[in-house]
């Protein structure tokens, strides 16, 4: 057999078996398993007398292992006494030693349990800057514990001075805690908070989980904006790949044309995201002519870390055409902003859904960061609707009380776009607050619709004008409603406000 | 015209290894990515691995360990290595190619190589 | 991992009829369902890519359809050479998966 160092184990008795005035009381220690013989046993006493045996060794039968047992007799103050005993082999190596320091007896304990419990991400599901892994140790018998953190197996440098420790009646619990980076805890290392108690380990692991549900990369490829495509006349079409693992291989993209013709000259952006992914974009410009007349662009993906290549493909949708109807809105004022307006615009039953946005003051596009527009949805018919909101200061308004809502679609004619006017003050801008120029229908709060609409302007709206429960061929979110002129005969009675 | 031809099947003891080859011919192998299938008599088609052109493998889960797939583009061969067989894996293997564009299935897969595991 | 599931596993039909076959995917695609159609004795054959492109030299009879997690293959007018057994394909994953494809749907004589 080859050379096999020992295994040592302290062997005690129960407290509770030891009667409390016995004046001497035995210990002992085992060392198993090795080979050659022999093993030297000597005890550390500290400042007690005692006598030691060593018996003599006995063979494992199945191994051909040896084993032995010293035991040691002390008397004395025994019971807070602390006692060494160490097993040297030298066959396994001159300096072959194991020390195991252990009291005279073990008392019935209860260990504890180890948990880590990690802080939550972000609301957006992303990890925060810094994660807390806070390593409950709980329901043990009160007693002497030591904590330590590792990381990936290795002993980590924490204060664990910030450790607190609880009694329940006859049980305790402790608690530590430990702070990350961010970079650290995406690292995929592994974290352990090691429990020493009685002589005992106990320990909890944890690492970033992998996602439940991995999406894998997936790639997207947009169209180009009406805007873009009908008014700047430089149409481009963006590839854009997203939650690729951030290594040495670099992401591949390949733009090309159905036709076979050449593709002109791509522009490449990458981006780290918060949750350690990459994002790669490529954007391609594309010539307005070609687009039109129906020619499909391919962007083809390959990265290392990619089972297969991705295309994705793009042309200009096809089916039937219809252009947008534009309404648009002012609220009136409300009671404590007085110096901002917020205007509405409504853009309904186009088709397709691809459209461009804009708002324009003083006969200048405004930057599109000034407004907020909801993607498109679909009407309940065939085509589609979405809002546009822009918020407006009273300089602004006093400037110049006109602001343009512009859709730019393919279908519009006769140059591809479709606008209205809006003033906030549409009595004082225009002349009368019975103007003839807005719809029969207003927005206007359907929490609020059994009261009377209060009027922009001063005006004062028709008694029969009421807030409807929403109109079937109004595709408004639910939060909107409609009002509905119900005057017969009339002239329609035109005003903008709050039911 | 695009070929895939199989070779290295037969039948083998549980617990044997084989060695599949998958010569291909008509078109740039190093271009395409490559993926074996198999089909079990009577049975569907199964996904056991895809090689990219980057020479990276991925595997069905339950051939992870078993199955190594390689390729040697200077030879355009393709190849799966099958260890510890047991009988449950007595199928027709194909050697197929994935699209060069990508993301759009198989467009061409061989014969087959039937591969028979029993004592 | 993505499961596919395609429905009915088998179909008897008439030459002439229209066959619907289905497969569902346990979470979307975004692109890349492929369908193939396969001879007894003989390897499969791609009909169909990315949802609904038909692949070069097959009849405009076949189609397929679908978005997100739905995806369907149609034959307008069964044909005597369209009994088969058809499968669909989740082709776009960008990991491993248990199984890419469907289980399976024999279109068999009425």
């Known amino acids: 057999a080859s050379t096999q160092s020992p295994s040592v184990f302290p062997l005690t008795r129960c407290c509770k078996n030891i009667p409390s005035n016995a004046t001497s009381v035995t210990l002992g220690c085992l060392a198993t398993g090795y080979f050659p013989e022999p093993v030297m046993v000597t005890w550390d006493t500290g400042s007690l007398n005692g006598t030691t045996m060593t018996l003599p060794a006995t063979t494992l039968t199945l191994s051909g292992h040896y084993a032995t047992i010293s035991l040691l007799t002390v008397s004395g103050a025994w019971a807070k006494q602390m006692f060494t005993c160490r097993v040297a082999h030298t066959p396994s190596s001159t300096d072959w030693v194991d020390n195991k320091t252990f009291s005279v007896c073990s008392r019935d304990f209860t260990p504890p349990t180890v948990k880590i419990l990690q802080s939550s991400c972000d609301g957006g599901g992303h990890f925060p800057p810094t994660i807390q892994l806070l390593c409950l140790v709980s329901g043990y018998t009160p007693g002497t514990i030591n904590i330590t953190w590792l990381e990936d197996g290795q002993v980590m440098d924490v204060d664990l001075s910030t450790a607190s420790t609880t009694q329940e009646g006859e049980l305790a619990s402790t608690q530590s805690e430990l702070t990350l980076s961010q970079k650290h805890w995406l690292s995929d290392r592994t974290y352990t908070c090691q429990v020493t108690y009685q002589g005992h380990t106990f320990e909890d692991s944890t690492k970033k989980c992998a996602d439940s549900n991995p999406r894998g990369v997936s790639a997207y490829l947009s169209r180009p904006s009406p805007f873009d495509l009908f008014i700047r006349k430089s149409p481009t079409i963006t590839c854009l790949v997203v939650d690729l693992a951030p290594s040495k291989g670099t992401v591949n993209l390949t733009w090309s044309r159905a036709s076979g013709k050449p593709v002109n000259h791509s522009t490449r952006k990458e981006e780290k995201q918060r949750n350690g992914t990459l994002t790669v974009t490529s954007t391609l410009p594309v010539g307005t002519r070609d687009w039109i007349e129906g020619e499909t662009y391919q962007c083809r993906v390959t990265h290392p870390h990619l089972p297969r290549a991705l295309m994705r493909s793009t042309t200009k949708t096809s089916g039937p055409r219809a252009a947008p109807e534009v309404y648009a809105f002012a609220t009136p004022e409300w009671p404590g902003s007085r110096d901002k307006r917020t205007l509405a615009c409504l853009i309904q039953n186009f088709m397709p859904e691809d459209i461009s946005v804009q708002w324009l003051h003083n006969e200048v596009q405004l930057p599109d960061a000034r407004h907020s527009t909801t993607q498109p949805r679909k009407t309940k018919g065939s085509g589609f609707f979405v809002f546009s909101r822009l918020e407006v200061t009273r300089a602004e308004w006093e400037q110049k009380d006109e602001f343009i809502c512009r859709a730019v679609h393919e279908a519009a004619s006769p140059s591809q776009t479709v606008q209205r006017a809006v003033s906030v003050n549409p009595g004082l801008a225009g002349g009368s607050a019975q103007s003839q120029r807005a719809p029969d229908r207003v927005l206007c709060h359907s929490g609020q619709q059994q009261g009377l609409p209060r009027a922009a302007g001063g005006s004062v709206p028709h008694p029969r004008c009421h807030c409807g429960a929403g109109r079937a061929d109004w595709p408004g979110p639910p939060e909107l409603d409609v009002c509905v002129e119900e005057a017969e005969g009339e002239a329609p009675w035109t005003w903008t406000g709050l039911c | 015209q695009v070929q895939l031809v199989e070779s290295g099947g037969g039948l083998v003891q549980p617990g044997g290894s084989l060695r599949l080859s998958c010569a291909a011919s008509?078109?740039?192998?190093?271009?395409?990515?490559m993926t074996w299938v198999r089909q079990a008599p009577g049975k569907g088609l199964e996904y056991v691995s895809i090689?990219?052109?980057?020479?990276?493998?991925w595997y069905a889960n339950w051939a992870s360990g078993r199955f190594t797939i390689s390729r040697d583009n200077s030879k355009n061969t393709v190849y799966l290595q099958i260890d510890s067989l047991r009988a449950e894996d007595t199928a027709t293997y194909y050697c197929?190619?994935?699209?060069?564009?990508?993301?759009?299935?198989?467009?061409?897969w061989g014969q087959g190589t039937l591969v028979t595991v029993s004592s | 991992d993505i499961q596919m599931t395609q429905s009915p596993s088998s179909v008897s039909a008439s030459v002439g009829d229209r066959v619907t076959i289905t497969c569902r995917a346990s979470?979307?695609?975004?692109?890349?369902l492929a369908w193939y159609q396969q001879k007894p004795g003989q390897p499969p054959k791609l009909l169909i890519y990315?949802?609904?492109t038909l692949a070069s030299g097959v009849p405009s009879r076949f189609s397929g359809s679908g978005s997100g997690t739905e995806y369907a293959l149609t034959i307008r007018s069964l044909k005597p050479e369209d009994f088969a057994t058809y499968y669909c394909?989740?082709?776009?994953?960008?990991?491993?998966?248990?199984?890419?494809f469907g289980g399976g749907t024999k279109v068999e004589i009425k």
């Open positions: 197929a190619r994935e699209t060069h564009h990508g993301s759009s299935g198989i467009d061409h």
């Open positions: 979470r979307s695609i975004y692109s890349g």
């Open positions: 394909q989740h082709a776009d994953y960008a990991h491993h998966s248990d199984n890419v």
């Open positions: 990315d949802h609904s």
């Open positions: 008509g078109f740039t192998l190093s271009n395409h990515d």
């Open positions: 090689i990219n052109t980057y020479g990276n493998h």
